[in-house]
C-alpha cells in the first residue's frame, strides 16, 4: 500500500516514461527531405509525454534507450507506382546536435506502399529526431497510415 | 530493500501491466471482415493480463497508453497472388463503444503476402479493439505468423 | 519521496528491465541458416542489459514476457532479385533449451528487400533465441537495416 | 574521486612529435568520451578531438586531421593524444577532460580536466 | 565552423554586483552551449550545461539563458572567488568551438 501511496504522489515525469506518437504534418519543401509531425490531443490520438516538438522535429527530453517506431504509407500509390518511383526510402535518425548525427533506421519501399519498423536505441536529452523520406512520392496524412512514436523503455 | 518488498507484496495488475498477444482462431462468416482471436496458455504463448476476449475480440481493462501490434500473413500466397487480389486491407480500430468508433493503423499487402507494425495510442477501459480483412485471400493461423497484441505502457 | 529513494538504491536489474539490441556479425556457414549477433557500446549502439550472447545467439536471464522486434534487409537487393530468389525466409524462435524449442516469428521476403516485426512472448531465464534466415540472399551489416532486439516487459 | 591526471611538461624542437599521456581514476573509464583541448599562452581553448575509449573510435578538428593520432590502454585507464611534425604555434598547454555524461548520451560538457601538460616547441 | 563571440572581451565589477555576459553563435544551436570558468593557471570548470542547467555542486547564484543563437551567463551576486575568465563552447556542430573569452577582474 505504501509503494502504490508513493507511486500516486511523484510525478510521473519521474518514473521516465516519456512517450510520444505523432501524426503527419507537412512533408518540406524542396530539398529539404524531412517529414515535419505534429501532435497534441486537440489533433486527434497524438500527445506528447514528456518529447516535444522543436518546427515540426521530435526531441528527446530525457536520457535513456527508447523504442522508436514508425510507420509510413505512401499517397496515391500502387506495387506499380512504388517499383516504377524506385528508389523511394524512409530514414529515422538523430539530426541535431549534428555533432551526434547518426542514422537508426532505414528501410525503402521497393514493390510496397507502406513501411513499418521499430527498434530500441539510445537517445540523450536534447537530441532530435528527424525522418527523410527520399524519392518523389507523398506521404498519406491519414493518422492510421501514417505516425511516428517513441516510448522510453530505461535508463 | 522496502521498495523491492512493496513491490512483491502488490498485484501486478495496480502496476498497470495489462498486456496480451493473441493467436488466430478463426474468419468471420462471410459480410464479417473481423478476425476472431483466442488466447491463454493452453493454446501455446498466447496470453491474457487484464485485457480480454469478448466473441474473440479484445477488450480493454484499464486506461492509458497503449503499443498496439499485428502481423497478419496470408495463406496460401505469393506475391503474384497478393497482387491479383489486391486490395487485400488490414485495418486495426476501436469497433466498440460505437461513439469512440476510430481505425487505429491500417495497412494494404500490395505484392506482399505478411504485413506487420505496431503503434502508441490511448484506450479506455471498455474499448474493444477490432481487426479488419477486407478481400478474398484467407490469413495463416500458423502462430508465429499471425498474431495481435497489446501492452499497457503509461496512464 | 520514500519510494524514489528506494528505486535510487535498487539496481536496475532489480527493477527487471532487461533488454538487448543487436547488430548483426556475421552469418553462419553453409548449412547453417543462423545469423550471428553482436551488442556492446564499444560498437555503436547495440547494447545488451540482462540477457547475453552465447556464440552470436542471444540468451534470456530473466523469466518474463518480452517484446520481441527484429528487422533484416538483404544486401545487393531490387524486388526482381527478391522474388528470383524466393522464397527468402526469417524465422525468429527459441532454438535451445532443444525440449524448449518453437518457432516465434515467421516472415518470407517475397518482392521485398526488408522485413520488420514485433511480437510480445514469454520467454524463460536460459532461453536461447535463434534467428534464421532460409535462401541464398545475404543480410546488409548496416547497422541501421539489420537489428535484432528484446525488451522484458512484465513477469 | 575522479581525475585525471596528465604526464609533465615537454620541451621538444620543431618537427618533431610529442605524446601526452592522461590517466583516469574514480569512474570507469571506458564509459565517458575523453577530450583533447589545447590553450596556447594568453589564448582561449581550442578543441582538438575525442576519443571514445570503449570502442577507441575517434573525431579529429579538421585543423589537427593529418597531425594527431589519439589513442588509449583501457587495461591502465589511460589516453594519450600524439601531436607530429610540431610548430612553434603549438605552443600550449594541453588538457584531457571527460564527457559529463555516459558513452551512448555524451553531450561534450567536459566536467572533469586534468591538470593540463605544458608543451613548448622551441628551436 | 561556427563562430561564438563573447562580450565584453573583459568586464570589472564588484563584489556583490549582478554580472551579465552573453555569447553569441555564427548560426541557430538550438541549447547546444556550456559555460566554463577558468582561473589563471587552472584548468577550466564546467558551471552551466545545456545553456541553461547548473553543473552539480555549482553555486545557485550562477544561471544560463537562451536558446538559437543568443544567450547570456548570469553571476547575481559576485563573490570574491569569482574573479576569472569565462567561456561558452558549442556543440551543436564539429568542430566543437569556444568563445574567445570574457575577463572578469575586480574594480
Known amino acids: 500500500q505504501r509503494f502504490a501511496q508513493a507511486q500516486q504522489q511523484l510525478p510521473l515525469e519521474s518514473l521516465g516514461w516519456d512517450v510520444a506518437e505523432l501524426q503527419l504534418n507537412h512533408t518540406g519543401p524542396q530539398q529539404d527531405p524531412r517529414l515535419y509531425w505534429q501532435g497534441g490531443p486537440a489533433l486527434g490520438r497524438s500527445f506528447l509525454h514528456g518529447p516535444e516538438l522543436d518546427k515540426g522535429q521530435l526531441r528527446i527530453h530525457r536520457d535513456g534507450i527508447y523504442m522508436v517506431h514508425i510507420q509510413v504509407t505512401l499517397a496515391i500509390c500502387s506495387s506499380t507506382t512504388a517499383s516504377r518511383h524506385h528508389p523511394t526510402t524512409l530514414a529515422v535518425g538523430i539530426c541535431s546536435p549534428a555533432s551526434r548525427s547518426i542514422s537508426l533506421l532505414r528501410l525503402s519501399f521497393h514493390q510496397g506502399c507502406t513501411i513499418a519498423s521499430q527498434r530500441l536505441t539510445p537517445l540523450a536529452r536534447g537530441d532530435t529526431l528527424c525522418t527523410n523520406l527520399t524519392g518523389t512520392l507523398l506521404p498519406s496524412r491519414n493518422t492510421d497510415e501514417t505516425f511516428f512514436g517513441v516510448q522510453w523503455v530505461r535508463p | 530493500q522496502r521498495f523491492a518488498q512493496a513491490q512483491q507484496q502488490l498485484p501486478l495488475e495496480s502496476l498497470g501491466w495489462d498486456v496480451a498477444e493473441l493467436q488466430l482462431n478463426h474468419t468471420g462468416p462471410q459480410q464479417d471482415p473481423r478476425l476472431y482471436w483466442q488466447g491463454g496458455p493452453a493454446l501455446g504463448r498466447s496470453f491474457l493480463h487484464g485485457p480480454e476476449l469478448d466473441k474473440g475480440q479484445l477488450r480493454i481493462h484499464r486506461d492509458g497508453i497503449y503499443m498496439v501490434h499485428i502481423q497478419v500473413t496470408l495463406a496460401i500466397c505469393s506475391s503474384t497472388t497478393a497482387s491479383r487480389h489486391h486490395p487485400t486491407t488490414l485495418a486495426v480500430g476501436i469497433c466498440s463503444p460505437a461513439s469512440r468508433s476510430i481505425s487505429l493503423l491500417r495497412l494494404s499487402f500490395h505484392q506482399g503476402c505478411t504485413i506487420a507494425s505496431q503503434r502508441l495510442t490511448p484506450l479506455a477501459r471498455g474499448d474493444t479493439l477490432c481487426t479488419n480483412l477486407t478481400g478474398t485471400l484467407l490469413p495463416s493461423r500458423n502462430t508465429d505468423e499471425t498474431f495481435f497484441g497489446v501492452q499497457w505502457v503509461r496512464p | 519521496q520514500r519510494f524514489a529513494q528506494a528505486q535510487q538504491q535498487l539496481p536496475l536489474e532489480s527493477l527487471g528491465w532487461d533488454v538487448a539490441e543487436l547488430q548483426l556479425n556475421h552469418t553462419g556457414p553453409q548449412q547453417d541458416p543462423r545469423l550471428y549477433w553482436q551488442g556492446g557500446p564499444a560498437l555503436g549502439r547495440s547494447f545488451l542489459h540482462g540477457p547475453e550472447l552465447d556464440k552470436g545467439q542471444l540468451r534470456i536471464h530473466r523469466d518474463g514476457i518480452y517484446m520481441v522486434h527484429i528487422q533484416v534487409t538483404l544486401a545487393i537487393c531490387s524486388s526482381t532479385t527478391a522474388s528470383r530468389h524466393h522464397p527468402t525466409t526469417l524465422a525468429v524462435g527459441i532454438c535451445s533449451p532443444a525440449s524448449r524449442s518453437i518457432s516465434l516469428l515467421r516472415l518470407s521476403f517475397h518482392q521485398g528487400c526488408t522485413i520488420a516485426s514485433q511480437r510480445l512472448t514469454p520467454l524463460a531465464r536460459g532461453d536461447t533465441l535463434c534467428t534464421n534466415l532460409t535462401g541464398t540472399l545475404l543480410p546488409s551489416r548496416n547497422t541501421d537495416e539489420t537489428f535484432f532486439g528484446v525488451q522484458w516487459v512484465r513477469p | 574521486q575522479v581525475q585525471l591526471v596528465q604526464s609533465g611538461a615537454e620541451v621538444t624542437k620543431p618537427g618533431a612529435s610529442v605524446k601526452v599521456s592522461c590517466k583516469a581514476s574514480?569512474?570507469?573509464?571506458?564509459?565517458?568520451?575523453i577530450y583533447w583541448v589545447r590553450q596556447a599562452p594568453g589564448q582561449g581553448l581550442e578543441w582538438m578531438g575525442w576519443?571514445?575509449?570503449?570502442?577507441?573510435?575517434?573525431n579529429y578538428a579538421q585543423k589537427f586531421q593529418d597531425r594527431v593520432t589519439m589513442a588509449r590502454d583501457t587495461s591502465i585507464s589511460t589516453a594519450y593524444m600524439e601531436l607530429s611534425r610540431l610548430r612553434s604555434d603549438d605552443t600550449a598547454v594541453y588538457y584531457c577532460a571527460k564527457d559529463r555524461k555516459r558513452e551512448y548520451y555524451y553531450n561534450f560538457g567536459m566536467d572533469v580536466w586534468g591538470q593540463g601538460t605544458t608543451v613548448t616547441v622551441s628551436a | 565552423d561556427i563562430q561564438m563571440t563573447q562580450s565584453p572581451s573583459s568586464l570589472s565589477a564588484s563584489v556583490g554586483d549582478r554580472v551579465i555576459l552573453t555569447c553569441q553563435a555564427s548560426?541557430?544551436?538550438?541549447?547546444?552551449l556550456h559555460w566554463y570558468q577558468q582561473k589563471p593557471g587552472k584548468a577550466p570548470k564546467l558551471l552551466i550545461y545545456?545553456?541553461?542547467d547548473l553543473e552539480t555542486g555549482v553555486p545557485s547564484r550562477f544561471s544560463g539563458s537562451g536558446s538559437g543563437a543568443d544567450f547570456t551567463f548570469t553571476i547575481s551576486n559576485l563573490q570574491p572567488e569569482d574573479f576569472a575568465t569565462y567561456y561558452c563552447q558549442q556543440y551543436d556542430h564539429l568542430p566543437i568551438t569556444f568563445g574567445q573569452g570574457t575577463r572578469l577582474e575586480i574594480k
Open positions: 548560426q541557430d544551436i538550438s541549447n547546444y
Open positions: 576519443i571514445n575509449p570503449n570502442s577507441g573510435g575517434t
Open positions: 574514480g569512474y570507469t573509464f571506458t564509459s565517458h568520451y
Open positions: 545545456d545553456a541553461s
